[in-house]
Amino acid sequence: CRTSECCFQDPPYPDADSGSASGPRDLRCYRISSDRYECSWQYEGPTAGVSHFLRCCLSSGRCCYFAAGSATRLQFSDQAGVSVLYTVTLWVESWARNQTEKSPEVTLQLYNSVKYEPPLGDIKVSKLAGQLRMEWETPDNQVGAEVQFRHRTPSSPWKLGDCGPQDDDTESCLCPLEMNVAQEFQLRRRQLGSQGSSWSKWSSPVCVPPENPPQPQVRFSVEQLGQDGRRRLTLKEQPTQLELPEGCQGLAPGTEVTYRLQLHMLSCPCKAKATRTLHLGKMPYLSGAAYNVAVISSNQFGPGLNQTWHIPADTHTEPVALNISVGTNGTTMYWPARAQSMTYCIEWQPVGQDGGLATCSLTAPQDPDPAGMATYSWSRESGAMGQEKCYYITIFASAHPEKLTLWSTVLSTYHFGGNASAAGTPHHVSVKNHSLDSVSVDWAPSLLSTCPGVLKEYVVRCRDEDSKQVSEHPVQPTETQVTLSGLRAGVAYTVQVRADTAWLRGVWSQPQRFSIEVQVSD
């Protein structure tokens, strides 16, 4: 037999079907010009010493072969003895290691069999009514196709599906969408209405994420507040990566899950912007404010479930950093300025009340005064911190107040509002005899003592009504009792107590009269 002809004899190898899983497959035959034809196939398994034979049976029952050698592609003309106008059945037999491996047959009319391409270029993937919709441009001059898809998950083998007939410049396919696992899809096409035409190769993989992105399983820790008033948020546990099917491993555009960090600064609600979204890889520095942090996972189909944490405010206080002066016109606060052109947010809320009741005020950008201080003033009429109660004050600073992650904490402290000197006056002052020349003075704690760091000391004043001599005794802010000694029997005394803050003298309590009775011996 001539090599260019199909040889109408039995092939030159013994007859021994291996029945093995390897061997030739995916046989495709088509016309490539007016009088030439090509068949190509794939061979799975070791290729050393393999000889391939293209077999063909005509409608007459005659059968022949082409010897392809080690090649997996063979061309022949319409003069090779194979009928091109009538239906023929072709298959490949591969002879190797004393056994024959056979491909599945294709039955077709060669003249009408055109080489079809798989979807080429960009395959657009979208979600439609709980299903996956794929769309692509029809390859040039190939309108009219049957389309199939195959898909697999990381744990399942290929499953075949049908896209139905296509007859337009764009083709599309509805495929199943998995809720929780990624899928790999491939598509192939063949000529529509041509009996037995060969399928194209499979397209490049189309990698599709699950409908629901995986819920982020991450943990955060937050560092101590630094000298600069900022603390770093760190990721303790990276989110788990999505398991991918074989063909999507490595480079898998389409299956990416992006994790974003959404910060919501709960403190200082009067600032311009309360939320900011960042990439999870870029862990921010935060002020000492309270925050809600959400990790949002999303893929090409949109966001999934998020995981939310609350980061409480840093409650470390600086009792001396804030000076407050109360005048007739109002109140002014002074604190060490951070830098030039800083915006400050002053936030206050009554102690022991819900954080939602915080009030705040935003200053215009300000430079330090000659003493290096920043200031904030308010009038009595404004009502700010006007009630006689304890307030927790936090001051935040930023050179870029519109950027949520650039705020820092300047200080946190306590302040007693209203007329603190009067409100702080100790009540229920009582005097008890202690010895022949001493008394014990007790009083109820000042309201100022409810405000950590505000009460500097108590002062107890004792006045000798005869000599008009006055003595004053400082008492620790944690004490509410003092012993006055060196007193004389029969002399009238008055005692008063006041409560002082670091910047304000208190108002004396009502004078309390007492005397030590003269002891008469029997």
């Epitope: 005659r62 059968c63 037999e93």
Partner: nanobody, 114 residues
Amino acid sequence: QLQLVESGGGLVQPGGSLRLSCAASGFTFSSYGMSWVRQAPGKGLEWVSYISAGGGTTTYVDFVKGRFTISRDNAKNMLYLQMNSLKPEDTAVYYCVHAADGSRGQGTQVTVSS
């Protein structure tokens, strides 16, 4: 000279079975692949199945796969076609064919009808 004689055809109901036989003589039967072809009324020849010389390789046209089985007995110079789950569209004259030179017998009629 080469001779092929088919037998075993007949009338059968849809879903029924038949076994066609082909007795070969006048050539070295065990050295050649063999085919079955058929011709339905008013239509051209249609290849159905092929079996290699030793019987190790068998091939079928799509529309009979899983229903028909080709086999041979080289010791008896016999070719067979077992046909199950027959359908009305299988009605035709069936011929056995010497796959190398295309010689065929006179055929056997298979009619599938209720």
